[in-house]
């Protein structure tokens, strides 16, 4: 044992981090120790393959020890780079271990669960138009378009709750083609379109 | 390199059970969902099920519920698929293959040629 | 369930010819459709994924369109090395079409 030797301690542990599919990403983690410690990443307590296992995969061991993904991979079912990572610094005199940080997968599905559908209501009635929109995570916001532009919602008469269009009471100029638009961090989805029709 | 290596051929008897196992190496077994599909001779291409090497969750088309059990042993990444009552129509090469993060079987196994027959 | 329908089952083509294969599925899949080639005795080659994406190494004569139930693989000057089976697949919940044979005429 030298004098000056100290064992690992984590100075910069990894963060939370919410990416797109497809995108690169960093799980940052940086120590301290000497002699100058080795990091490994583990993932659901079992040790993360990098380009020094293989140089050919999409995660790399950055000099720093920060974990780097050139892309996220995520499908519907394969799912390699979601979940809960720390990395482990050691040295001869001992190890040292970083706060636990999730990596979640940003998705937005294609396929409205429910599209609106056509409504046909008299003027002055009360019309509602109803939405599922994709699958998502985060959970996507719900928006409406009117004839290909985005719908006043601060006309009072106006109410989006939910996957709902509600029109207390129906003017003439509501009449239109109405879709409703799924958002969160990956994009947007537009639904098929509903026609509203307003009868004299 | 990444690759899936199953077992070998195997002839059995109508009635009989058959157990096929697929070796992957080269990248995180738990992550990636793996298929099972068969092939009659001259025949097309037909999807038996997956198994999520996670969790060990499967699912399969209702034709074969109930006749067919996948599983896998995490600490050697294989997958194993098991057919019973095995018929004369089950003569095919049954293949594992595991599915990208794009949704499509990227890598297979070689194959393994089963034979029912009295 | 999904059916995937194929078409044609069997064409017949000389090495510069431009191949179209159509695949169509039962309801919308969105983009979640693949193609793969197959040759006698080997595993299925993966070509195409999310209906247009050339897989790593592909070489670039094939390509893939369409999305909800419309699809097609092309193949835009077939080489020799061309000539096999071609098998559409929806990742949707899984099924594959029954298949294309590409013959030399």
């Known amino acids: 044992l030298r004098q000056e030797d100290f064992p690992p301690r984590i100075v910069e542990h990894p963060s939370d981090l919410i990416v797109s599919k497809g995108e690169p990403a960093t799980l940052n983690c940086k120590a301290e120790g000497r002699p100058t410690p080795t990091i490994e990443w583990y993932k659901g307590g079992e040790r993360v393959e990098t380009d020094k296992d293989d140089p050919r995969s999409h995660r790399m061991l950055l000099p720093s020890g920060s974990l780097f993904f050139l892309r996220i991979v995520h499908g519907r079912k394969s799912r390699p780079d979601e979940g809960v990572y720390v990395c482990v610094a050691r040295n001869y005199l001992g190890e040292a271990v970083s706060h636990n940080a999730s990596l979640e997968v940003a998705i937005l599905r294609d396929d409205f669960r429910q599209n609106p559908s056509d409504v046909m209501v008299a003027v002055g009635e009360p019309a509602v138009m109803e939405c599922q929109p994709p699958r998502g995570h985060p959970e996507p916001t719900i928006s409406w378009k009117k004839d290909g532009s985005p719908l006043d919602d601060k006309d009072e008469r106006i109410t989006i709750r939910g996957g709902k269009l509600m029109i207390t009471y129906t003017r003439k100029s509501d009449a239109g083609k109405y879709v409703c638009v799924g958002t969160n961090m990956v994009g947007e989805r537009e639904s098929e379109v509903a026609e509203l029709t307003v009868l004299e | 390199e990444v690759q899936l290596v199953q077992s070998g051929a195997e002839v059995k008897k109508p009635g009989a059970s058959v157990k096929v196992s697929c070796k992957a190496s080269g990248y995180t077994f738990r992550g990636y969902a793996m298929h099972w599909v068969r092939q009659a001779p001259g025949q097309g291409l037909e999807w038996m099920g997956w198994i999520n090497p996670r969790s060990g969750v499967t699912e399969f088309p209702q034709k074969f519920q109930g006749r067919v059990t996948m599983t896998r042993d995490t600490s050697i990444t294989t997958a194993y698929m098991d057919l019973s009552r095995l018929r004369s129509d089950d003569t095919a090469v049954y293949y594992c293959?595991?599915?990208?993060?794009?949704?499509?079987?990227?890598?297979w196994g070689q194959g393994t040629m089963v034979t029912v027959s009295s | 369930d999904i059916v995937m329908t194929q078409s044609p089952s069997s064409l017949s083509a000389s090495v510069g010819d431009r191949v179209t294969i159509t695949c169509r599925a039962s309801?919308?899949?969105?983009?979640?459709l693949n193609w793969y080639q197959q040759k006698p005795g080997k595993a299925p080659k993966l070509l195409i994924y999310?209906?247009?994406s050339l897989q790593s190494g592909v070489p670039s004569r094939f390509s893939g369109s369409g999305s909800g139930t419309d699809f097609t693989l092309t193949i835009s000057s077939l080489q020799p090395e061309d000539f096999a089976t071609y098998y559409c697949q929806q990742s949707y919940s899984t099924s594959f079409g029954g298949g294309t044979k590409v013959e030399i005429k």
């Open positions: 999310a209906a247009s």
């Open positions: 293959a595991r599915e990208s993060g794009d949704d499509a079987f990227d890598i």
């Open positions: 309801q919308s899949i969105s983009s979640y």
